[in-house]
C-alpha cells in the first residue's frame, strides 16, 4: 500500500474566459512532512502556480475543505482566467529538506479556456 497518494480527481476542466477555475487536489496524509506546490507543465521549464509560504500569487486562492476527515485538501482557485492560462496543472508533494525533494505528483488536470 502506498504511503502517500496525491489525487487530482478531474482530468480536465473547461472554463470561460474571465471566470474562475477550481483545481482540486487531495493528499491522503501530511506525512511525509513537506509542502504541496502547484505547477503548470512538467520538467525544468514548468511554471510555479502556487506555493503556500513563498512568493506572491495574487490570482490564486486556496479553497480547501477542512471538514474532509479522511484526507487533506490542497485545492486552489485561479481567478480571471485568460486563454494564456490553458495547460495542464499538477499538484506536487515535496518532502521537507535542504532543498525540498519532489516526492509525488498528481496525474494532472488539463485546463481549457472557452471564449466568453
Amino acid at each position: 500500500e502506498e504511503e502517500l497518494q496525491v489525487i487530482q480527481p478531474e482530468k480536465s476542466v473547461s472554463v470561460a474566459a474571465g471566470e474562475s477555475a477550481t483545481l482540486n487536489c487531495t493528499a491522503t496524509s501530511l506525512i511525509p512532512v513537506g509542502p504541496i506546490q502547484w505547477f503548470r507543465g512538467v520538467g525544468p521549464g514548468r511554471e510555479l502556480i502556487y506555493h503556500q509560504k513563498e512568493g506572491h500569487f495574487p490570482r490564486v486562492t486556496p479553497v480547501s475543505d477542512p471538514t474532509k476527515r479522511n484526507n487533506m485538501d490542497f485545492s486552489i482557485r485561479i481567478s480571471n482566467i485568460t486563454p494564456a492560462d490553458a495547460g495542464t496543472y499538477y499538484c506536487v508533494k515535496f518532502r521537507k529538506g535542504s532543498p525540498d525533494v519532489e516526492l509525488k505528483s498528481g496525474a494532472g488536470t488539463e485546463l481549457s479556456v472557452r471564449a466568453k
Partner: antibody
C-alpha cells in the same frame, strides 16, 4: 471498535533502555500514521515520535532524537518505541496514538508508565 | 518551535453556562485554508480524546455543545451549555509545523 494497547513500561535506571509496544485493532493499521505522546505532571503533553503509514519516514523532537527509535510491523498491527540512554526527564505516561491524515490524533491508548530513577 | 499559550489554566463555570478556552500560537498554523489546531478532552485516569479537529470541525460522536473557532494564531474552544460530564482538562495541539506542540491545559470545574 478501535483499540490501542500499550505495554513495556516499567522502572529503569538512568542510562538504561526500554522497548514500548502498541497493539492496534479495529482499524486499518497500515493506512494510519502512528505516534507516541507522553504526559508528565510537570510538562503536560509532549509529542515524542511519529512514523508514516508504511514505516519509511520517522520524526522526533530534539529532546529524544538519537535516543529513541520508532518502528512498526504492519503485518502484526504493532508499533514499537525503542528508548535508549534514558534520563529522569523521560519519566512519563506514554500514549500510543493514531493519525489518519498525519494531523490530529484520532485515537489514543490507555498509556503505559515509564519511570527512570536510580 | 511553535509555542502555544493556553489560557486560563483553570476555569470554574456554572452548569448551563458558557465556558471559553483560548490558545494562541507563536506563529501561524494555517496552510491551504486549513488551520492545524486541534482540541482534546482528558478526564482523570483516562487518555485524551479528540473533540475538535482543524480549528472548527466536530469529531464524530462529540456533542454539539462543543465548538471551535479561530485561524492563524488565535483559537477558541467553547462549551455551551456546560454539563457536569464536561469536567475535565482541555488541551489544544498544533500540527502546523514540527515539532508538534500542545498547550499547557485548562482545567474546567463546576462553580
Amino acid at each position: 471498535e478501535v483499540q490501542l494497547v500499550e505495554s513495556g513500561g516499567g522502572l529503569v535506571k538512568p542510562g538504561g533502555s526500554l522497548r514500548l509496544s502498541c497493539a492496534a485493532s479495529g482499524f486499518t493499521f497500515s493506512s494510519y500514521v502512528m505516534s507516541w505522546v507522553r504526559q508528565t505532571p510537570g510538562k503536560g503533553l509532549e509529542w515524542v515520535a511519529t512514523i508514516s503509514s508504511g514505516g519509511t519516514y520517522t520524526y522526533y523532537p530534539d529532546s529524544v532524537k538519537g535516543r529513541f527509535t520508532l518502528s512498526r510491523d504492519n503485518a502484526k498491527n504493532s508499533l514499537y518505541l525503542q528508548m535508549n540512554s534514558l534520563r529522569a526527564e523521560d519519566t512519563a505516561v506514554y500514549y500510543c496514538a493514531s493519525q489518519l491524515t498525519g494531523s490530529e490524533f484520532d485515537y489514543w491508548g490507555q498509556g503505559t508508565t515509564v519511570t527512570v530513577s536510580s | 518551535d511553535i509555542v502555544i499559550t493556553q489560557s486560563p489554566a483553570s476555569l470554574a463555570v456554572s452548569l448551563g453556562e458558557r465556558a471559553t478556552i483560548s490558545c494562541r500560537a507563536s506563529e501561524s498554523v494555517d496552510s491551504y485554508g486549513n488551520s492545524f489546531m486541534h482540541w482534546y478532552q482528558q478526564k482523570p485516569g483516562q487518555p485524551p480524546k479528540l473533540l475538535i479537529y482543524r480549528a472548527s470541525n466536530l469529531e464524530s460522536g462529540v456533542p454539539d455543545r462543543f465548538s471551535g473557532s479561530g485561524s492563524r494564531t488565535d483559537f477558541t474552544l467553547t462549551i455551551n451549555p456546560l454539563q457536569a460530564e464536561d469536567v475535565a482538562t482541555y488541551y489544544c495541539h498544533q500540527s502546523g509545523d514540527l515539532p508538534w506542540t500542545f498547550g499547557g491545559g485548562t482545567k474546567v470545574e463546576i462553580k
